[in-house]
């Protein structure tokens, strides 16, 4: 039997996943967005500024189980999912409301993972098999990068990461956090 699906903090149901999930469905369908964060309102202002420092991107908290063959993590892990296009920071809270999204006419701006952290997970296996320990790579922050028409994705231009950093005061080396800090983060996610 498969593992039960579960709810994450963005209200959607997430089935079991491998170590790295596919981008979850809420990235393309705003119906499952965290309503408290989204508000469901369209952007109030058209995009005008060209100031790079105002570019930012959405960081969605995503909770999932780690699986390895028939084994599944004892507890879910929480990481960020970097959402779609980038827009001016001042519009971000409402930027995806009602399916609307700012899109540049020239270069493509993408929100991609910036920093990662490592977290050890305990995998429980069926049939009395001994638990396994695994260290997984989790997205810790996102950033905007610019992709021009003349470049492929390997040549994304860094837009400066400060505007896209999580607002929770993450340290420069987010993976060097204690197990207690990671546990607290998980517990606070529910």
């Amino acid at each position: 039997q498969g593992w039960q699906a579960f709810k994450n903090d963005a209200t959607e149901i997430i089935p079991e996943l491998g170590e790295y999930p596919e981008p979850p469905p809420e990235l393309e369908n705003n119906k499952t967005m965290n309503r408290a964060e989204n508000g469901g309102r369209p952007p109030h202002h058209p995009f005008e500024t060209k100031d790079v420092s105002e570019y930012s991107c959405r960081e969605l908290h995503f909770t999932r189980y780690v699986t390895d063959g028939p084994c599944r993590s004892a507890k879910p892990v929480t990481e960020l999912v970097c959402s779609g296009q980038c827009g001016p920071a001042r519009l971000l809270p409402n930027a995806i409301g009602r399916g609307k999204w700012w899109r540049p006419s020239g270069p493509d701006f993408r929100c991609i993972p910036d920093r990662y952290r490592a977290q050890r997970v305990q995998l429980l296996c069926p049939g009395g098999e001994a638990p396994r320990a695994r260290k997984v790579r989790l997205v810790a922050s996102c950033k905007c990068k610019r992709l021009t028409r003349f470049h492929n994705q390997s040549e994304l231009k860094d837009f400066g990461t400060e505007a896209a950093r999580p607002q929770k005061g993450r340290k420069p080396r987010p993976r060097a956090r204690s197990a207690k800090a990671n546990q607290a983060e998980l517990e606070n996610a529910y």
């Epitope: 170590e19 999930p21 970097c82 260290k135 994705q153 060097a176």
Partner: antibody, heavy 117, light 111 residues
């Protein structure tokens, strides 16, 4: 079972280009990071590049940055390495490896790239 | 990333135990980063033998074990067998968790 099969290697002149492919099977391709690792004749292993599960983030060793491009097609379960401006020092066996849990748990058999005039 | 340091060669007789060291810096091996070990027979692809310092993948003999002290990780092979003769590489990941560094490799000869 997990299988990774590289192809596309061969003899190329300095300054030339080559595209390597790695066909994967036996696992959920889109759920894993993947890497290219190379080994020059008689030398050790050198990590070249990796790519995250959906291809949105790519990373390179300094020695290949700006010349090599890693990409993936999740619909075809295939990993690629586009190698441009090749140099003699790029001569090596190139392995694709599944980059899972911060180590390489499965490797392909490798494909030889020879850069020579 | 600077390569990890391994001895070029080690040797031992069948039935003996040998240890291969892998020395890094505080930002790779010595940090919370974990070390993995790979075995490579001539003309073959590398095979994962140890991950996360001291964990064995299923199918790997329990004669192989790993440990770490400070900036040095070690691979110990007990009860040496002829088929253990191969090159062994240690590896760790960089600070960003997106790059990797390998040791120069150690040739194990079973006398």
């Amino acid at each position: 079972q997990v299988q990774l099969v590289e192809s596309g290697g061969g003899l190329v002149q300095p300054g030339g280009s080559l595209r390597l492919s790695c066909a994967a099977s036996g696992f959920t391709f889109r759920s894993h990071w993947l890497s290219w690792v190379r080994q020059a004749p008689g030398k050790g292993l050198e990590w070249v590049s990796n790519i995250n599960y959906d291809g949105s983030s790519t990373y390179y060793a300094d020695s290949v940055k700006g010349r090599f491009t890693i990409s993936r097609d999740n619909s075809k379960n295939t990993l690629y390495l586009q190698m441009n401006s090749l140099r003699a020092e790029d001569t090596a066996v190139y392995y694709c490896a599944r980059d899972t849990y911060l180590h390489f748990d499965y490797w392909g058999q490798g494909t030889l790239v020879t850069v020579s005039s | 990333d600077i390569a990890l340091t391994q001895p070029a060669s080690v040797s031992g007789s069948p039935g003996q135990s040998i240890t291969i060291s892998c020395t890094g810096t505080s930002s790779d091996v010595g940090d919370i980063n974990d070390v993995s070990w790979y075995q490579q027979h001539p003309g073959k692809a590398p095979k994962l033998m140890i991950y996360d310092v001291n964990n064995r993948p299923s199918g790997v003999s329990n004669r192989f074990s790993g440990s770490k002290s400070g900036n040095t990780a070690s691979l110990t092979i007990s009860g040496l067998q002829a088929e253990d003769e191969a090159d062994y590489y240690c590896s760790s990941y960089g600070e960003s968790l997106t790059s990797y560094v390998f040791g120069g490799g150690t040739k194990l000869t079973v006398l």
